[in-house]
């Protein structure tokens, strides 16, 4: 069964006029790539490259296309049925807890750890302890900072932003 977006979640002033007659539960909805007219009678196409809708809906407006930020590359353009897909540039990644920006991947693992995962657009390099093989949780400093810290003194984590 197709997913659909209805006006129930919208503010009252954004809702379209009620349909006079619905011969099925979904009559009065418009297909993906469209929104409904103010009088609720017609379906109006989203504008290619400007806005979109992904599901059957009775929205008065299509959703605005995302513009990729600097530091991101456009994987696929916005169409009337699908939003733009943006991805972090090579050497940067987007964390789940800070999805608003791409952050620089670390250049290497701290002393005593080995790299088991590369930098990808959605994850930093992955480091594990040589002996135990357990993952290092949280941010760890890059190789250069580890090397410069005094023996016996743990290096403090630094926050790298893209």
């Amino acid at each position: 069964e197709s997913a659909l977006i209805t006006q129930q979640d919208l503010a009252p002033q954004q809702r379209a006029a009620p349909q006079q007659k619905r011969s099925s539960p979904s009559e009065g909805l418009c297909p993906p790539g469209h929104h409904i007219s103010e009088d609720g009678r017609d379906c109006i196409s989203c504008k290619y490259g400007q806005d979109y809708s992904t599901h059957w809906n009775d929205l008065l407006f299509c959703l605005r296309c995302t513009r990729c930020d600097s530091g991101e590359v456009e994987l696929s353009p916005c169409t009337t049925t699908r939003n733009t897909v943006c991805q972090c540039e090579e050497g940067t990644f987007r964390e789940e807890d800070s999805p608003e920006m791409c952050r620089k991947c670390r250049t290497g693992c701290p002393r005593g750890m080995v790299k088991v995962g590369d930098c990808t657009p959605w994850s930093d390099i992955e480091c594990v302890h040589k002996e135990s093989g357990t993952k290092h949780s949280g941010e760890v400093p890059a190789v250069e900072e580890t090397v410069t810290s005094s023996p016996g003194t743990p290096a403090s984590p630094c926050s790298l932003s893209g």
């Epitope: 197709s2 979904s26 993906p32 196409s45």
Partner: antibody, heavy 119, light 107 residues
């Protein structure tokens, strides 16, 4: 390959009804919207309405709303268009056509069904 | 309803000619226009959508352009098999409407 196969030609008297069928094959029936478009002899094309099997959504052109009924039998992947209170100006070739759930252009068409209304 | 006015309604050209068919919408339809080719006794075939995107398998001699209210279908070098009637269609707002057609023949 995608095929839309329509029922055969019909001759009807004014005031009668006609029911034309369109059997779809070669794709997932519930993923595309099916439409009815008609063409009077020597004339242009006129969109009548759609049926979407994925959620049973139906939309009619207001011009035909009182006389047309579009239904479907999902078990046989068939869509039907019934036009009632026929008049001579309803003489036309009736096409079913499909479109993806996006922009409203038609990528595949049935072969057409000629409906002749004559007393 | 949006009216789609096609011109000319009849066109005669020679093989190899560049042929242009125009379509004017009665109101702004953005780029939501499709073009179809229909041969006698056959169903229409999709050529162009979104004003300028060629449908799969359509020869590259067919091209479309335009936005807003004025649209053009161009055949860069007319071939004998292009003899047909051509229709524009707006897919911007329901009811979707078609132009009256342009009948193209070879001189």
């Amino acid at each position: 390959q995608v095929q839309l196969v329509q029922s055969g030609a019909e001759v009807k008297k004014p005031g009668a009804s006609v029911k034309v069928s369109c059997k779809a094959s070669g794709y997932t029936f519930t993923e595309y919207i099916l439409h009815w478009v008609r063409q009077a002899p020597g004339q242009g094309l006129e969109w009548m309405g759609w049926f979407y099997p994925g959620n049973n959504n139906i939309k009619y052109n207001e011009k035909f709303k009182d006389r047309v009924t579009i239904t479907a039998d999902k078990s046989t992947s068939t869509v039907y268009m019934e036009l009632s209170s026929l008049r001579s100006e309803d003489t036309a070739v009736y096409y079913c056509a499909r479109h993806e759930q996006g922009p409203g252009y038609f990528d595949y068409w049935g072969q057409g069904t000629l409906v002749t209304v004559s007393s | 309803d949006i009216q789609m006015t096609q011109s000319p309604s009849f066109l005669s050209a020679s093989v190899g000619d560049r042929v242009t068919i125009t379509c004017r919408a009665s109101q702004d339809v953005n780029t939501a226009v499709a073009w179809y080719q229909q041969k006698p006794g056959k169903a229409p075939k999709l050529l162009i959508y979104w004003a300028s995107t060629r449908h799969t398998g359509v020869p590259d001699r067919f091209s479309g352009s335009g936005s807003g209210t004025d649209f053009t279908l161009t055949i860069s070098s007319l071939q004998p098999e292009d003899v047909a009637t051509y229709y524009c269609q707006q897919h911007y707002i329901t009811p979707w409407t078609f132009g009256g057609g342009t009948k193209l023949e070879i001189k």
